[in-house]
């Protein structure tokens, strides 16, 4: 049974995933990107559930992606660390879903735009929080 | 009014670690949009950037001082730190903390005092 | 990396117009915002223009900034040269894995 330690860590681990995937939502969505309109042409891969850290294996499968696109994005005014922000954003990613057990993700029949991307996960974040607190 | 004050040890032995911490008052670490920044000044010369974090945590590093530098945050106390491992002469300098904006380029504003680590034994 | 490149000195009388210069060496100037902060002795640096051309609240219009693509580099003016503008000066920019300051310009008021 988790203790009341490891739940705290979770939640604060699940807290710091979530303020990054904000602040690069919060980017995109800033007045000043140019490339917004081509961001929006990529598309990402959701899940088809997404109700347990196993199922970050889904977020995981698509970071690299998700860099790419971010690096692509690049302007004078979108200016993100996209290796270092991904690898920050992966880490916790491993650290949450756990290694001890595999999970084949399950993804569903319609992609979305990484602001749709983003907001999935981000409703993740927030509701795997609100069972912990 | 945002100020941003550093405190540590002035003195730091060579091969041990630099330890500084910068409060935040006026503002809020948490309040997102920015990160927070640690910069070096080595006597008479140059402006150096040492890192940054976020909030949650998520930190940028100076590729030349990766290896040996860590920082970190505590928002409940709305302070961030830096821990500067295996130090030498080298590492003599003022070291200044600062906020960043996230998003829109990497500039510093406002600045801490600064406060003078010299490494010596 | 990249490096910034600046004069290591300048010097103009009260009332003159002075420009410091900040070369880049690889890599766009244009790419990414510049940075110009002033730092007078003893003090920590406080920003005179930031995202190429822009002046933070404060600071008077006599400091300005510029982007020249042709040379590759930035470019501070500060126009009415007063005596309280003597102070080094150094720009910074950055790319998607560092930052970095120019080695500082000091500007001496003459007279």
């Known amino acids: 049974a988790p203790t009341s330690s490891s739940t705290k860590k979770t939640q604060l681990q699940l807290e710091h995933l979530l303020l990054d995937l904000q602040m690069i939502l919060n980017g995109i969505n800033n007045y000043k990107n140019p490339k917004l309109t081509r961001m929006l042409t990529f598309k990402f891969y959701m899940p088809k559930k997404a109700t347990e850290l196993k199922h970050l294996q889904c977020l995981e499968e698509e970071l690299k992606p998700l860099e790419e696109v971010l690096n692509l994005a690049q302007s004078k005014n979108f200016h993100l660390r996209p290796r270092d922000l991904i690898s920050n954003i992966n880490v916790i990613v491993l650290e949450l879903k756990g290694s001890e057990t595999t999970f084949m993700c399950e993804y569903a029949d319609e992609t979305a735009t990484i602001v749709e991307f983003l907001n999935r996960w981000i409703t993740f974040c927030q509701s795997i929080i609100s069972t912990l607190t | 009014q945002l100020q941003l004050q550093e405190s540590g040890p002035g003195l730091v032995k060579p091969s041990q670690t630099l330890s500084l911490t910068c409060t935040v008052s006026g503002g809020s670490i948490s309040s997102g949009g920015y990160y927070w920044s640690w910069i070096r000044q080595h006597p008479g010369k140059g402006l150096e950037w040492i890192g940054y974090?976020?909030?949650?945590?998520?930190?940028y590093y100076n590729p030349s001082l990766k290896s040996r530098v860590t920082i970190s945050v505590d928002t409940s106390k709305n302070q961030f730190s830096l821990k500067l491992s295996n130090v030498t002469a080298a590492d003599t300098a003022v070291y200044y903390c600062?906020?960043?904006?996230?998003?829109?380029?990497?500039?510093?504003?406002?600045w801490g005092r600064g406060t003078l680590v010299t490494v010596s034994s | 990396n990249f490096m910034l490149t600046q004069p290591h000195s300048v010097s103009e009388s009260p009332g003159k117009t002075v420009t410091i210069s900040c070369t880049r060496s690889?890599?766009?100037?244009?790419?990414?915002?510049v940075q110009w902060y002033q730092q007078r002795p003893g003090s920590s640096p406080t920003t005179v223009i930031y995202e190429d051309n822009q002046r933070p609240s404060g600071v008077p219009d006599r400091f300005s900034g510029s982007i020249d693509s042709s040379s590759n580099s930035a470019s501070l003016t500060i126009s009415g040269l007063k005596t309280e503008d003597e102070a080094d000066y150094y720009c910074?920019?950055?790319?998607?894995?560092?930052?970095?300051f120019g080695g500082g310009t000091k500007l001496t008021v003459l007279g």
């Open positions: 910074q920019s950055y790319d998607s894995s560092n930052v970095v």
């Open positions: 600062a906020r960043t904006p996230t998003v829109t380029g990497d500039w510093f504003d406002p």
């Open positions: 974090i976020y909030y949650s945590g998520s930190t």
């Open positions: 690889s890599g766009s100037i244009a790419s990414n915002y």
